[in-house]
Interface confidence: low
């Protein structure tokens, strides 16, 4: 294997770095961009989709969780398979699964089916990160590897920017919708879900033009196929550099004898499904065996250390980046509540209310013979009030409650004032006629605040750009470990600044700072993971570590967001401790700069 690694490095040097790698860079970049988009889709559509699908808080939480769960399963599954079946083939299948179910999720109406589609869409895209980095690294010579893998990371950021920009451009346009009867509705948020499937679809189209990784071929004893691909790399680069006459001089490449080839059984043995069953079991056994070998004597220490680094990084990064918008929403809510207008002891008779009431408390009021027609109530509370001979018609409300109120001879016609909006209230001789159809839940709706989140995410992902550029330029100069540890320490320091962010704009600026600093850690971690494992274990290990990363993300998000409105200190402390632990673990890993790809 060492001999193959040295020879392969020499061949890649001869092939040069040029048009072939740059083409592959953009193709794989699209696949990575699809992953960057996936993380944001559900969060962005929730404010709009919650009304359409009548989502309770637990439903919304489950929807957010299911994406990470899907990506976790997908990373492990496709990562393992890509070491056995090939990088290109598995990436094509995983992206196809992603696009098909992302496409379906745009059209399905029910919550259950939407959840299922997003789960499978997540499973599909889960394969993107582990395969893309391994695949690209196998076309890069040692001197350029760190830098160009870091440039590739930029596409994850581009995915986030794309998702935020599209959400901003599409979701607020209520006009972009149609209805087929009362049962089928296609609103603008569904257009957004559809548009978010584009990077994945384009990646599939572009990937069909690219060859399989020659290193994978060599690892699986396919000498001729590997030679053809390497010749294609060489010839493409030489033609682009104006040297078409240069000949690919390699005649023989060392290959590894493949011992555990897929079990093949003769076509006359049993039914087709039995044959496929045997193949699947055989493949599953090989994938599992390969995974367990990452914990064998040779790799156990590296794997455990990498698990620690991936977990702490992900826990703090995802925890904080989801906590930020929640914190901003909390600050907005506090500010909104501070501006609540209180109306004590109103006595209103023979008046027609036909306008919007927002952010008000009416206390101890008496309403006699009043009409509430075509009224919009947003965050309005009526407390200890009396309504007598009143008439409510075409009333829509959100976050509106009647507490300890008495209604006498009052009629409610075509309103969404459902039972739960009357708290300890008494209704005497009052009737509800033709309550509004649809969702009986109180949804926050899509106000300016909801759309503000798209802009914040847009800024947050864009702020990563400088950190990305710096880390790419320095990756091969200062080394992966210094980059990882240094960036983790800087992220840790930037964490502490969060304690001073009391305004919305300060929190956004600090989110940008944290994102910009921590991206270098992610880039270094991706490069390290690719280089620490041999080619027959590379995507398996990467997939497992990426799955662990998603698990840590879910834990981080759950723990951090539970402190919103209680304390800022706990999340900051947790994140700082995790980052400090991560950087100390990172320093114990072996440096891979200047190393040939095993």
């Amino acid at each position: 294997r060492e001999e193959l690694a040295q020879q392969y490095e020499a061949i890649l040097r001869e092939c040069g770095h040029g048009r072939f790698q740059w083409t592959l860079y953009f193709v794989l970049g699209l696949a990575l961009m699809a992953d960057g988009v996936e993380v944001f889709v559900v969060g962005f559509v929730l404010p709009s989709a919650e009304k359409d699908m009548c989502l309770s808080d637990s439903n919304k939480g489950m929807l957010g969780l299911i994406v990470y769960l899907g990506m976790m399963v997908g990373a492990f599954l496709w990562g393992g398979l890509a070491d056995r079946l090939g990088r290109r083939q598995c990436l094509l299948i995983s992206l196809s699964v992603n696009s098909v179910f992302a496409f379906f999720s745009s059209f399905v109406q029910g919550y259950g089916t939407f959840l299922f589609c997003r789960l499978l869409s997540g499973v599909g895209i889960g394969g993107s990160i582990p395969i893309v980095f391994s695949y690209f690294s196998e076309f890069l010579a040692q001197e350029k590897r760190g830098e160009h893998l870091s440039w590739l990371c930029m596409f994850w950021m581009i995915g986030g920017v794309y998702a935020a920009a599209m959400a901003w451009a599409i979701i607020p346009h209520y006009g972009w919708s149609f209805q087929m009867g009362s049962a089928y509705q296609f609103h603008s948020w569904r257009v957004f879900v559809l548009v978010c499937a584009f990077p994945s679809v384009f990646a599939i189209g572009a990937l069909t033009t690219q060859p399989e990784s020659p290193r994978f071929f060599l690892e699986n004893g396919k000498h001729d196929e590997a030679w053809m691909v390497l010749k294609q790399v060489h010839d493409t680069n030489m033609r682009a550099k104006g040297h078409p006459e240069r000949v690919f001089s390699v005649t023989h490449i060392k290959t590894i004898h493949q011992e555990d080839e897929l079990i093949e059984i003769q076509s006359d043995t049993g039914a087709w499904y039995q044959r496929w069953g045997v193949r699947a079991l055989s493949l599953g056994g090989q994938v599992w065996g390969n995974f367990l070998s990452c914990f064998g004597p040779e790799y156990r220490r590296i794997t455990l250390m990498m698990m620690g680094v991936w977990f702490t990084m992900s826990f703090s990064y995802y925890g904080l980046t989801v906590w930020f918008p929640d914190m901003i929403r909390h600050l907005q809510a506090v500010d909104y509540a501070a501006r609540t207008k209180v109306f004590p002891g109103e006595r209103v008779e023979h008046v027609t209310f036909n306008f919007t009431l927002e952010n008000q408390i009416h206390r101890g009021g008496q309403y006699f013979n009043d009409k509430f027609i075509g009224l919009r109530l947003k965050s309005v509370s009526f407390e200890d009030s009396l309504f007598e001979e009143c008439y409510f018609e075409d009333v829509t409300s959100s976050n509106t409650f009647f507490r300890n109120c008495t209604f006498i001879n009052t009629v409610f016609y075509n309103t969404d004032l459902f039972e739960y909006k009357f708290v300890n209230s008494r209704l005497v001789n009052s009737t509800f006629l033709h309550n509004k159809e649809g969702c009986p839940l109180d949804v926050t709706g899509t106000g300016e605040g909801a759309y503000m989140v798209y802009f914040v995410s847009f800024l947050g992902t864009l702020a990563v750009l400088p950190g990305n550029i710096v880390s790419a330029l320095l990756m091969d100069k200062i080394g992966r470990l210094r980059m990882l540890a240094g960036s983790s320490v800087m992220s840790c320091v930037s964490c502490f600044f969060l304690s001073f962010g009391n305004s919305e704009s300060a929190m956004i600026a600090l989110l940008c700072l944290f994102g910009g600093v921590s991206i270098a850690s992610w880039n270094a971690l991706d490069v390290l993971t690719v280089e620490l494992y041999p080619s027959d274990k590379r995507t398996t290990a990467f997939g497992f570590l990426n799955a662990l990363c998603k698990l840590a993300a879910v834990l981080g998000i759950s723990i951090f967001t539970s402190f919103v409105g209680i304390t800022k200190a706990a999340p900051i402390l947790f994140a700082s401790a995790a980052l400090a632990l991560g950087s100390s673990l990172a320093l114990k890993l072996p440096e891979t700069r200047g190393q040939v790809l095993q």
Epitope: V342, F343, P344, G345, E346, R347, V348, E349, V351, F353
Partner: nanobody
Framework: QVQLVESGGGSVQPGGSLRLSCAVS????????MGWYRQAPGKQRELVAY???????SYVDFVAGRFTISRDNTKNTVYLQMNSLKPEDTAVYFC?????????????WGQGTQVTVPP
């Protein structure tokens, strides 16, 4: 758009009385609280008296006992009865629609009415 027209101002000797009126249009008068404000030369505009839609009144300390705010919902008018006037009451008086005491009024300001109490 809420429109406000103040009237009833004038010049009066110290200890005298005046009754200011304010006609309101462009809003459902009976559901809104109303306030009388004044602006003395070179000073900020300040709220001096307030009446809720239910008829509850509030005053600033320096006019309490001398000024009385009242409203007539049938005429969409709010009044300010000013007794025992002092030279320091000299100002332009405005009325406006306010959801509550201390909250920003939301009508567009009228021309106001000048009250002068010579020393």
């Amino acid at each position: 758009q809420v429109q406000l027209v103040e009237s009833g101002g004038g010049s009066v000797q110290p200890g005298g009385s005046l009754r200011l009126s304010c006609a309101v249009s462009g809003t459902i008068f009976s559901i809104n609280g109303m306030g009388w404000y004044r602006q003395a030369p070179g000073k900020q505009r300040e709220l001096v008296a307030y009446i809720t839609s239910g008829g509850t009144t509030s005053y600033v300390d320096f006019v309490a006992g001398r000024f009385t705010i009242s409203r007539d919902n049938t005429k969409n008018t709010v009044y300010l009865q000013m007794n025992s006037l002092k030279p320091e009451d000299t100002a332009v008086y405005f009325c406006n629609v306010a959801r509550n005491w201390g909250l920003e009024p939301f009508g567009s300001w009228g021309q106001g009415t000048q009250v002068t109490v010579p020393p």
